[in-house]
């Protein structure tokens, strides 16, 4: 059994999150993850989910009673999601820490926008996609 | 030329982001994107970048002078990053809108943690990885 399981059970007690009523009104993440089978689609969604958990854990960083559990889970997330690559994790953290209200950050983001957009689609590397592909489908 | 280019140039003027001094102290996004060639790694990073831009645009939603530019760029992001798939974009938006300080959201997130973790690594779908694969690499 992976180390995170025991520690996640510990967090469930702490957050009173073991009761069946917690599942009322649907899931946060599981339903969405079910929708996406493609690895690249899953990474788009999981990126947001992982950053949510990191933010949540940061909010409870001073609570000693769950420190060990939080650290173990974060470590296991590093292994599973970042494939144990510290550089990948560090780059991710940088992105999550940029402040959207910082004027210098805003200017930089807009300055880089055209190049960021040019790289967004996988097709960007293999030539330009036809405009006919560019409708919005549901 | 994609429609976003002209509109991004318009935003550069609005944000005074065209000057060379904006590039001082390194890039926000471009340097990080250079580090990752694998499509799934790129999606992890781009997911954070796109959510940053959406948040930034939301902060300026009442500014009429850049409304058209913002809308055009968002539309092009939908095409390029979400492959024009509205369901994908909607699921993404849901994830970015969850409040980390909402007690019900916290409980749900912890309730789902074990299952989310089990799905994090690509290998999760093809059987359990050997423990020897689970080291932390730099």
């Amino acid at each position: 059994q992976d180390p995170y399981v025991k520690e996640a059970e510990n967090l469930k007690k702490y957050f009173n999150a073991g009761h069946s009523d917690v599942a009322d009104n649907g899931t946060l993440f599981l339903g969405i993850l079910k929708n996406w089978k493609e690895e690249s689609d899953r990474k788009i969604m999981q990126s947001q989910i992982v950053s949510f958990y990191f933010k949540l854990f940061k909010n409870f960083k001073d609570d000693q009673s769950i420190q060990k559990s939080v650290e173990t889970i974060k470590e296991d997330m590093n292994v599973k999601f970042f494939n144990s690559n510290k550089k990948k994790r560090d780059d991710f953290e940088k992105l999550t820490n940029y402040s959207v209200t910082d004027l210098n950050v805003q200017r930089k983001a807009i300055h880089e926008l055209i190049q960021v957009m040019a790289e967004l689609s996988p097709a960007a590397k293999t030539g330009k996609r036809k405009r006919s592909q560019m409708l919005f489908r549901g | 030329q994609d429609p976003y280019v002209k509109e991004a140039e318009n935003l550069k003027k609005y944000f005074n982001a065209g000057h060379s001094d904006v590039a001082d102290n390194g890039t926000l996004f471009l340097g990080i994107l250079k580090n990752w060639k694998e499509e799934s790694d790129r999606k992890i990073m781009q997911s954070q970048i796109v959510s940053f831009y959406f948040k930034l645009f939301k902060n300026f939603k009442d500014d009429q002078s850049i409304q058209k530019s913002v809308e055009t760029i968002k539309e092009d992001m939908n095409v390029k990053f979400f492959n024009s798939n509205k369901k994908k974009r909607d699921d993404f938006e849901k994830l970015t809108n969850y409040s980390v300080t909402d007690l019900n959201v916290q409980r749900k997130a912890i309730h789902e943690l074990i299952q989310v973790m089990a799905e994090l690594s690509p290998a999760a779908k093809t059987g359990k990885r050997k423990r020897s694969q689970m080291l932390f690499r730099g």
């Epitope: 590093n78 510290k86 | 423990r131 080291l135 932390f136 690499r137």
Partner: antibody, heavy 123, light 111 residues
Amino acid sequence: EVQLLESGGGLVQPGGSLRLSCAASGFTFSSYAMSWVRQAPGKGLEWVSAISGSGGSTYYADSVKGRFTISRDNSKNTLYLQMNSLRAEDTAVYYCAKDGSSGWYVPHWFDPWGRGTLVTVSS
Amino acid sequence: NFMLTQPHSVSESPGKTVTISCTRSSGSIVSNYVQWYQQRPGSAPTTVIYEDNRRPSGVPDRFSGSIDSSSNTASLTISGLEAEDEADYYCQSYDGSNRWMFGGGTKLTVL
């Protein structure tokens, strides 16, 4: 100040065994992954083995897999390397090294290093 | 497994600048951190650069690290060479399959 002190090296015949120890002080030992790196006389550095802070995960270079065992005793702040079926090519100075940053299962860089202990495998 | 290839030796005069290269044979140099260690004769290695370009406290700013993705090469640059910089220098990175790789080492001679 972080200190790492290796011991247990010496002369051993091919096929023999040795157990190296590394006594650590000046940091929270259990929070850091630890490694053994060796250096044959006049040669470069070679990573040998690593272990997570808890001791739950261990990793080996192909050249020593099945012969060497890394372990740690966090209550004694000590790292070990049990070396069996020793060969002439295992002759080297063996360094113990701490991970450069905490909170990772294994090191991504090595800092600091101990002074090393010399293992000589010869008949 | 990839290899990290360094020049066997480099030499330069005091006060000058020297660059030691470390080329990754396969896989991208930018996708894992690169470290540099200095080893003086008879001593254990010490870190001079970690995480591509960061300097541990106590290491002078004459030492700098850089990465060039186009040549798949990491470089250690030492400016204002001093006699005490004479040593062996090793680059190190993760190999992508649970192993840590070292370059073969470069002997720096200060003339």
